[in-house]
Amino acid sequence: VPRWRQQWSGPGTTKRFPETVLARCVKYTEIHPEMRHVDCQSVWDAFKGAFISKHPCNITEEDYQPLMKLGTQTVPCNKILLWSRIKDLAHQFTQVQRDMFTLEDTLLGYLADDLTWCGEFNTSKINYQSCPDWRKDCSNNPVSVFWKTVSRRFAEAACDVVHVMLNGSRSKIFDKNSTFGSVEVHNLQPEKVQTLEAWVIHGGREDSRDLCQDPTIKELESIISKRNIQFSCKNIYRPDKFLQCVKNPEDSSCTSEI
């Protein structure tokens, strides 16, 4: 008799999930020799242990602690780039500006980037059919809890000037409900972080508005200021030129505003 299976509203676990996580771990340690001490099989076992046989709406940060411990990594605390709704450009930036790091440039962020996963209560099976959706099903699902956990730890580690890249094309440039707005902003440590500098990325070629005056940016400034952290904001009018100038800062066209 086929066992009844819970149908969730979100997509199921990414195909080849175990193989992908293990392969990514091996790749990461090849690319980052300073992480060679990491045993990738143990990392996978800890990852699996966080959600397998557990109800996918009842996952806690505690479930991920063994994985967090294995994935402990020191990144330069003054070289952290946060982002919200503009992941690709943030990653293109750290690919060029090698001394800066997004969460996905760390081992744990790299392992899980763009993946979905969940298990089922009391069975060792991975659910490839469906997983809980944050809005429609539950917020304490394996993926959401993972990102909340690693995002909190990443923000807590930051110091000095922290940068955040924001998408100026969205109706809410700063969204209180995003991971940045709901987790990272509130976990920056005022005793370590001097300034949060927002880079607002413009989408339109002819968009010359000062998006740093946007009401949602003012809201961000207010939240940050109340936490005794200074706030600054820059418009990036030409993201393509911005990246080009990061690559070739000596280019004569890079002295003008980008």
Epitope: T20, A23, R24, I31, P33
Partner: antibody, heavy 120, light 107 residues
Framework: EVQLVQSGAEVKKPGATVKISCKVS????????MNWVQQGPGKGLEWMGW????????DVAEKFQGRVTITADTSTDTAYMELSSLRSEDTAVYYC?????????????WGQGTTVTVSS | DIQMTQSPSSLSASVGDRVTITCKAS??????VDWYQQKPGKAPKLLIY???NRYTGVPSRFSGSGSGTDFTFTISSLQPEDIATYYC?????????FGGGTKVEIK
């Protein structure tokens, strides 16, 4: 069986650009980093750089920066190495290579090599 | 970059002889040294990884040892098919760097 099959020999003029391909089979292309290695005639081996095909992230040895572009096409499971502004000292055999699961960080898998001759 | 100084650059030995090649790293590379064999017109072939681990299918006459900065590669009993150039490579830090190679010939 893991296989890395490279494109054929090339003869180029100084100042030109060459693009070598490395088509893989026998494993999931995005699961491994692809490296490129140069070997001049009668010379030793020199690591040029790598690409993570899953994300397109690359790293190129300082000696080759500005002239080498490494790319990957996940739809065809092929990695590419492009070398521009060719000069006579770029005459060499170029290899793609990757690590394996039971080989530490050594390269058990190599392409057969592509000979590039730069001559006016 | 880490320099890998390999010696000798060439050697000639008789079949059955014990052959030893050394590689010295300019700084500590832990055990992250691999040894390759390359025959003319062919791609290099991995023999030893992580200083002392024989890769799958590699005959037991090939061995490696060392850690830190000093590494040794040994062929316990040289065979005619071992005629080749041997390279060490450090895989501890980017960029990976190779030794200059040792050409092994039969007397």
């Amino acid at each position: 069986e893991v296989q890395l099959v490279q494109s054929g020999a090339e003869v180029k003029k100084p100042g030109a650009t060459v693009k070598i391909s490395c088509k893989v089979s026998g494993y999931t292309f995005t699961d491994s980093v692809m490296n490129w290695v140069q070997q001049g005639p009668g010379k030793g081996l020199e690591w040029m750089g790598w690409i993570d095909p899953e994300y397109g992230r690359t790293d190129v040895a300082e000696k080759f920066q500005g002239r080498v572009t490494i790319t990957a096409d996940t739809s065809t499971d092929t990695a590419y190495m492009e070398l521009s502004s060719l000069r006579s000292e770029d005459t060499a055999v170029y290899y793609c290579a990757r690590t394996g699961y039971n080989s530490g960080y050594g390269f058990p898998y190599w392409g057969q090599g592509t000979t590039v001759t730069v001559s006016s | 970059d880490i320099q890998m100084t390999q010696s000798p650059s060439s050697l000639s030995a008789s079949v059955g002889d014990r052959v030893t090649i050394t590689c010295k790293a300019s700084q500590n590379v832990d055990s992250d040294v691999d040894w390759y064999q390359q025959k003319p017109g062919k791609a290099p072939k991995l023999l030893i990884y992580k200083a002392s681990n024989r890769y799958t299918g590699v005959p037991s006459r090939f061995s490696g040892s060392g850690s830190g900065t000093d590494f040794t590669f040994t062929i316990s009993s040289l065979q005619p098919e071992d005629i080749a150039t041997y390279y060490c490579m450090q895989s501890n830090t980017h960029p990976r760097t190779f030794g200059g190679g040792t050409k092994v010939e039969i007397k």
